[in-house]
């Protein structure tokens, strides 16, 4: 088999026939050096999954539940291409599983016990697996058989396809539990009708069900959605209030050597020639000899899944939690109201050591998880491997796009009411050596630049955003002659000045000596022409305040700031000479952990915060000898956000817009993956 062949896995005679037709028609339109199709027939989707893992086939299209199976060891498959529905302009690759209730019913998600429930059908995704999976640990024991536990949880249900003899309560609202449209409460529309008729108190359906059944907005306004955080939202706010976001139908391949680019090339060309309304003789999204053969008949085309996206991220934390609960059936010993330990994400060895020290001192309240980059940490928080970390505003933006929420803000000024008063922010500045007297904001081209890291606020988003507005392109590595911007591509001129050794060169963590505020300033001191840092960086590292050999003899007076009007000013005049105001660093977490992270961190800062006077004899949370480990070293306290509890509200409209403009220059693979899930 030539290397450019994609071996498609078919699960029935009809699929195999369509696959052969697909193969033959592709041959007729694609040059001989292009991708081609071969067909492999297996007895089931699980056999296809195993065949792909064993390198006997390359691709198959799966429903969400099977994507989960495909991801589990030893299969280790990943999503590579998604089918989309709707229009090319507004492609839908996911649907949302929701819990719909009547507006005046007054209960929340955590008060469903004893209510009457309407389900699309036993074993179906939105109607059963997701809601029951998420409620699993609230079900009365024994939880097996599951139907019995569910019957004892709700006071009555309609769960079409259930066994009405063994579990009559599941058929109480729809006598007989018929498994077809003959049952008026079967399927999405049926489950909604069950709610509408007043038979049930809650209907588990998908987000589009209510729109398909109620054309009139006034009618829709009589209903609400139950959110996982025990609030309610209007039915059109399903993106912010759902049980899970579920991919509709996805092509999977091996994680390693999986031919994902070839599969995309093949399917992209296939949709060009044989997609919706393209060809009479062969149609990719049509099944004359059956239904949904190889691809869903309702699909309109394909989208490439971003490479950073593994199955866990693609399926989402809620969906994975629900399915894992159902499959593994494990719950914590009697659930308590007490918070579990918060798993803090630490970057590289330096942060991990400080985190471990915190963990020991916290007496079991904090545990530590390691990752190599900030984006890896954010991904771990998203999928539940970690719970929280403190982030620069640029990463608060990425975390927010990935569904995380800010929970507390670092405050840098001493005040009587520190914890209750989140600050307006700090200043992003451009620092130069006083001796380079001809250097201004207007003649930085060809100079050597020092950045905290790619994607961070003061070191990248603000200066590069301003620069982009001037030069109208993203080739910043051509604008500066060389520099150190940790997180840049290793062969970029923006890694040339960096000092990390071997694989650590230009890495966006403390293994790179020029990483972060202190690192970028050190880069200026030793090699660079300009450093993009925060307004406190120079005073914090001069006048003997940083004892490291490179810094101990530095004098603040030897440095100046570049102002946007082309002038220069002394370092202490940052309030009148800065690039922009930056939002303070903030702690982020998943929505489901928000309350516990808030509670535990408030306790921890009372024990180890800036009220500790002697850091040589005690653990201090906000100290790490100018290395900004876990938190910025100038943090005075972690402050409540009050109503600024989403990333947009926290960062502010101006900053969100500025980062949004820079998106076209973004190299963030995580941001690309998260905007695929939520454009």
């Amino acid at each position: 088999v030539p290397d450019k062949t994609v071996r498609w896995c078919a699960v029935s005679e009809h699929e195999a026939t369509k696959c052969q037709s697909f193969r033959d028609h592709m041959k007729s339109v694609i040059p001989s050096d292009g991708p081609s199709v071969a067909c492999v027939k297996k007895a089931s989707y699980l056999d296809c999954i195993r065949a792909i893992a064993a390198n006997e086939a390359d691709a198959v299209t799966l429903d969400a539940g099977l994507v989960y199976d495909a991801y589990l060891a030893p299969n280790n498959l990943k999503p590579v291409v998604a089918e989309f529905y709707g229009s090319k302009e507004d492609p839908q690759t996911f649907y949302y599983a929701v819990a719909v209730v009547k507006k005046d019913s007054g209960f929340q998600m955590n008060q469903l016990r004893g209510k009457k429930s309407c389900h699309t059908g036993l074993g179906r995704s939105a109607g059963w697996n997701i809601p029951i999976g998420l409620l699993y640990c609230d079900l009365p024991e024994p939880r097996k058989p599951l139907e019995k536990a569910v019957a004892n949880f709700f006071s009555g249900s309609c769960a079409p396809c259930a066994d009405g003899t063994d579990f009559p309560q599941l058929c109480q609202l729809c006598p007989g539990c018929g498994c077809s449209t003959l049952n008026q409460y079967f399927g999405y529309s049926g489950a909604f009708k069950c709610l509408k008729d007043g038979a049930g108190d809650v209907a588990f359906v998908k987000h589009s069900t209510i729109f398909e059944n109620l054309a009139n907005k006034a009618d829709r306004d009589q209903y609400e959605l139950l959110c996982l955080d025990n609030t309610r939202k209007p039915v059109d706010e399903y993106k912010d209030c759902h049980l899970a976001q579920v991919p509709s139908h996805t092509v999977v391949a091996r994680s390693m050597g999986g031919k994902e680019d070839l599969i995309w090339e093949l399917l992209n060309q296939a949709q060009e020639h044989f997609g919706k309304d393209k060809s009479k003789e062969f149609q990719l999204f049509s099944s004359p000899h059956g239904k949904d053969l190889l691809f869903k008949d309702s699909a309109h085309g394909f989208l490439k899944v971003p490479p950073r996206m593994d199955a866990k991220m693609y399926l989402g934390y809620e969906y994975v939690t629900a399915i894992r609960n159902l499959r593994e059936g494990t719950c914590p010993e009697a659930p308590t109201d007490e918070c579990k330990p918060v798993k803090w994400c630490a970057l590289s060895h330096h942060e991990r050591l400080k985190c471990d020290e915190w963990s020991v001192n916290s007496v079991g309240k904090i545990e530590c998880v390691s990752a190599e980059t900030t984006e890896d940490c954010i991904a771990k928080i998203m999928n539940g491997e970690a719970d929280a970390m403190s982030l620069d505003g640029g990463f608060v933006y990425i975390a927010g796009k990935c569904g995380l929420v800010p929970v507390l803000a670092e405050n840098y000024n001493k005040s009587d009411n520190c914890e209750d008063t989140p600050e307006a922010g700090y200043f992003a500045i451009a620092v130069v050596k006083k001796s380079a007297s001809d250097l201004t904001w207007d003649n930085l081209k060809g100079k050597k630049s020092c950045h905290t890291a790619v994607g961070r606020t003061a070191g990248w988003n603000i200066p590069m955003g301003l620069l982009y507005n001037k030069i109208n392109h993203c080739r910043f590595d051509e604008f500066f002659s060389e520099g150190c911007a940790p997180g840049s591509k290793k062969d970029s001129s923006l890694c040339k000045l960096c000092m990390g050794s071997g694989l650590n060169l230009c890495e966006p963590n403390n293994k790179e000596g020029y990483y972060g505020y202190t690192g970028a300033f050190r880069c200026l001191v030793e090699k660079g022409d300009v450093a993009f840092v925060k307004h406190q960086t120079v005073p914090q590292n001069t006048g003997g305040k940083n004892p490291d050999p490179w810094a101990k003899n530095l004098n603040e007076k030897d440095y100046e700031l570049l102002c946007l009007d082309g002038t220069r000013k002394p370092v202490e005049e940052y309030a009148n000479c800065h690039l922009a105001r930056a939002p303070n660093h903030a702690v982020v977490t998943r929505k489901d952990k928000e309350a516990c992270v808030h509670k535990i961190l408030r306790q921890q800062q009372h024990l180890f915060g800036s009220n500790v006077t002697d850091c040589s004899g005690n653990f201090c949370l906000f100290r790490s000898e100018t290395k900004d480990l876990l938190f910025r070293d100038d943090t005075v306290c972690l402050a409540k956000l009050h109503d600024r509890n989403t990333y947009e509200k926290y960062l502010g409209e101006e900053y969100v817009k500025a980062v949004g403009n820079l998106r076209k220059c973004s190299t963030s693979s995580l941001l690309e993956a998260c905007t695929f899930r939520r454009p």
């Epitope: 471990d356 963990s359 020991v360 001192n361 007496v363 079991g364």
Partner: nanobody, 112 residues
């Protein structure tokens, strides 16, 4: 009240070894983990190694591969085995567990 007593320090040539011990009086010692710190003259106290109740260990970068921390809960003791000692390892070594004040420490001097 639990007290910590460190011992095992001394004068040793570069490349040599020492085994420090930290013994606790009282019960419940190290239930949340034990940390060895050191302080060189005129410098900040720095973390050297730690061991948690589940046996997890971690070390500062400069001692990794040379030092090993271990514990024996039955003996209420934590050890720090130090091999391939370097002059930069000189200082007073202290062990610490949450809620218990620092002890006197034990002096380690490595001559070149």
């Amino acid at each position: 009240q639990v007290q910590l007593v460190e011992s095992g320090g001394g004068l040793v040539q570069a490349g040599g070894s020492l085994r420090l011990s930290c013994v606790a009086s009282g019960s419940g010692f190290g239930i949340n983990g034990v940390i060895w710190y050191r302080q060189a003259p005129g410098k900040q106290r720095e973390l050297v190694a730690l061991i948690k109740s589940d046996g997890y260990t971690n070390y500062r970068e400069s001692v990794k591969g040379r030092f090993t921390i271990s514990r024996d809960d039955a003996k209420n003791t934590v050890w720090l085995q130090m091999n391939a000692l370097e002059p930069e390892d000189t200082g007073v070594y202290y062990c610490k567990t949450p809620g218990v004040p620092f002890g006197q420490g034990t002096q380690v001097t490595v001559s070149s």
